[in-house]
Structures are given as structure tokens and as C-alpha cells.
Amino acid sequence: ITRQSLDPQRRAAPQQKRSSPTEGLCPPGHHISEDSRECISCKYGQDYSTHWNDFLFCLRCTKCDSGEVEVNSCTTTRNTVCQCEEGTFREEDSPEICRKCRTGCPRGMVKVKDCTPWSDIECVHKES
């Protein structure tokens, strides 16, 4: 996209801090104005930006789903960190849902690792 001097629909609220872009980019915690002349701060707890950017708006903070707990709340420079509730875990294959951890191992196997928010219990065969 090429700029060749933007929107009452989306003017910054008076309390939002403003500064000038550096080489066309705004620092983490800010987004650029539509005329590319100002950096406008993100709204704490509502949106964020993690890198130097030329976004027209900050990114919306994630809201933790039911079945998740908030480990870190959203700041202007970091998104919310959500974690599966105790007794559930998030699989790499389906990261959008927390699955229940198994309660025990099958017959002939023993538990070597407990359930964590990132992994199910781990079972290995009993040594004979």
C-alpha cells in the first residue's frame, strides 16, 4: 500500500496519549493514526500491540473462554494469557479447547507424569 494528508468514526479519545511515528512506525502499545502523523496509545485492558507497527488500530485483547483461567491480564503491550483449568489440558492438535485429563492409566501401566494445563497424564508399561 502506498501513501500519497483519518476518521471521526474512529478518533482517539482525549485521554489516549499521542506521539510521532519513527520511520513510519509506532512503538509497542500504540497504533498509527490514519494520516500517518501520530502514534495513539492502545486502551489498557481492551487492546494491545506487541511490536513496532503501522496498524490503524490496536489488536483486541483475548477473553478467556469458560474452562480457562486468566494467568496474565491484557496490557497495552501484551495479550491476555489464558490457561486450561485444573484437570484439563490443551492439545497441540486442537488448541482451541481444553480437554479433560485422564483420571488414571490403563491396566498394566503406571503414571509417570501428572496432568498439566499443557499435557495429559503420561503412562508407561509396568516393568515385569
Epitope: I1, S5, D7, P8, Q9, D35, D54, L56, L59
Partner: antibody, heavy 117, light 110 residues
Framework: QSVEESGGRLVTPGTPLTLTCTVS????????MSWVRQAPGKGLEWIGI?????TTYYASWAKGRFTISKTSTTVDLKVTSPTTEDTATYFC??????????????WGPGTLVTVSS | ALVMTQTPSSVSAAVGGTVTINCQAS??????LAWFQQKPGQPPKLLIY???KLASGVPSRFSGSGSGTEFTLTISDLECDDAATYYC????????????FGGGTEVVVK
């Protein structure tokens, strides 16, 4: 609320052409406006956008080939030096800001430009 | 420049069926994706904005998902009136990123 394009016609290659998008029922000081084109039987191609305050941005391929400007009720698209590849229906569309996204929600019916010698 | 790759280019399904259209961005566009429906001789119609939000008056049979570079439009309980060409577009979100469209997907309803 409506938008309507006009100015499409048959032109010879190299003859500058200006298309006009006339809006009613809303103010251009509150909305950004995009121009999009569609060659016969082909897909949509974004040309550029003019913000509510008049800043213009163009697609990488469109730089230098088009100029967007506006008055209080119209948005113009100037095709600086048309080639046969610019034969297309040209649409203008109003961009609505939804809080964390823009989208072209209101479109005109389009105006056909034919470039031929 | 940003490139939006849409697949398939054409898909056919029966009334009452489900159609899935994929859109891939050549760079991270976060959730800034819109879907449009276009019928012959008409301008495009906005269906979905911000990846998954339904535009006003659009039936809930249309749904969108994805983020980053991979996006999907799903049309369920297909109706004859859904026969059209569908386009994805990277919506305006960055000073340096084009608002590119995908190549389009023709949906044929049998």
C-alpha cells in the same frame, strides 16, 4: 444512504479519464472510501482508499496509475494513462469502521470503462 | 505485496449441503478479513467482517473462522440463492498493507 459511480465510457489508450462516485445520505468527512475494479469475467481488484480527512493510499500496483481525490459529496478516481488492461467495471465502496476492523459495506452499482483503440 | 490465495476456484454442492471456502494470506493479517458474495451484474455484498462477524441482515448459515494467515468461510444448509462467487479480502488495517482480494470461488448449487 447510497453511492453511485459515473463517468465510465469508451476511451482510447493514453487518454486520461476521471470517474466520479457521488454519495448521498452520509458525510464523506465521516467515512473512508475505496475504489475497486473488476475486469470482464475476472475477480475483484482493490485500487486504493481515501480517508475521511483526505489521506490517500494505493495498492502497490496502482501507484502512479491512479489518483483519488474528493469534494464534500463526491470521490473521484483519475485513470492517468489508461491501457487496454484497465478495461473493467469500477466500483466505489464506503468503508465502515467496526471498532477493530474496517469493511466495505456499501457499494455502488459500478461504471464500465472500456479502453480500446 | 500481500497476496490472498483462495481455494477452491469452484465448488458444487446440493441444496441443504455445506460448502467450505479457504483463504490464505501471504503474511499475518490477524483478524482483518472480510468475505463478500457477488452475483452476475451486481456489486459485491459484504457477508462477514473481522473474520467471523456477520454483517447486518446476513443469515447465520454463513460463518467465518481463522486468524493470522488461514481463514475459512462455511455456508451450511445451502440454498439455491447462495449460488454466487465469493471473495475474501484483507480489510484495511495497516498503512503498508494492500487490501488485496482473493481470486474468488464460484459456488454452484445443485
Amino acid at each position: 444512504q447510497s453511492v453511485e459511480e459515473s463517468g465510465g465510457r469508451l476511451v482510447t489508450p493514453g487518454t486520461p479519464l476521471t470517474l466520479t462516485c457521488t454519495v448521498s445520505g452520509f458525510s464523506l468527512s465521516n467515512y473512508a472510501m475505496s475504489w475497486v475494479r473488476q475486469a470482464p469475467g475476472k475477480g475483484l481488484e482493490w485500487i486504493g482508499i481515501i480517508s475521511s480527512s483526505g489521506t490517500t493510499y494505493y495498492a502497490s500496483w496502482a501507484k502512479g496509475r491512479f489518483t483519488i481525490s474528493k469534494t464534500s459529496t463526491t470521490v473521484d478516481l483519475k485513470v492517468t494513462s489508461p491501457t487496454t488492461e484497465d478495461t473493467a467495471t469500477y466500483f466505489c465502496a464506503r468503508e465502515t469502521y467496526y471498532g477493530y476492523s474496517y469493511a466495505a459495506g456499501l457499494w455502488g452499482p459500478g461504471t464500465l470503462v472500456t479502453v480500446s483503440s | 505485496a500481500l497476496v490472498m490465495t483462495q481455494t477452491p476456484s469452484s465448488v458444487s454442492a446440493a441444496v441443504g449441503g455445506t460448502v467450505t471456502i479457504n483463504c490464505q494470506a501471504s503474511q499475518n493479517i490477524y483478524s482483518n478479513l472480510a468475505w463478500f458474495q457477488q452475483k452476475p451484474g451486481q456489486p459485491p455484498k459484504l457477508l462477514i467482517y473481522e473474520t467471523s462477524k456477520l454483517a447486518s441482515g446476513v443469515p447465520s448459515r454463513f460463518s467465518g473462522s481463522g486468524s493470522g494467515t488461514e481463514f475459512t468461510l462455511t455456508i451450511s444448509d445451502l440454498e439455491c440463492d447462495d449460488a454466487a462467487t465469493y471473495y475474501c479480502q484483507s480489510s484495511w488495517h495497516s498503512i503498508s498493507t494492500d487490501c488485496a482480494f482473493g481470486g474468488g470461488t464460484e459456488v454452484v448449487v445443485k
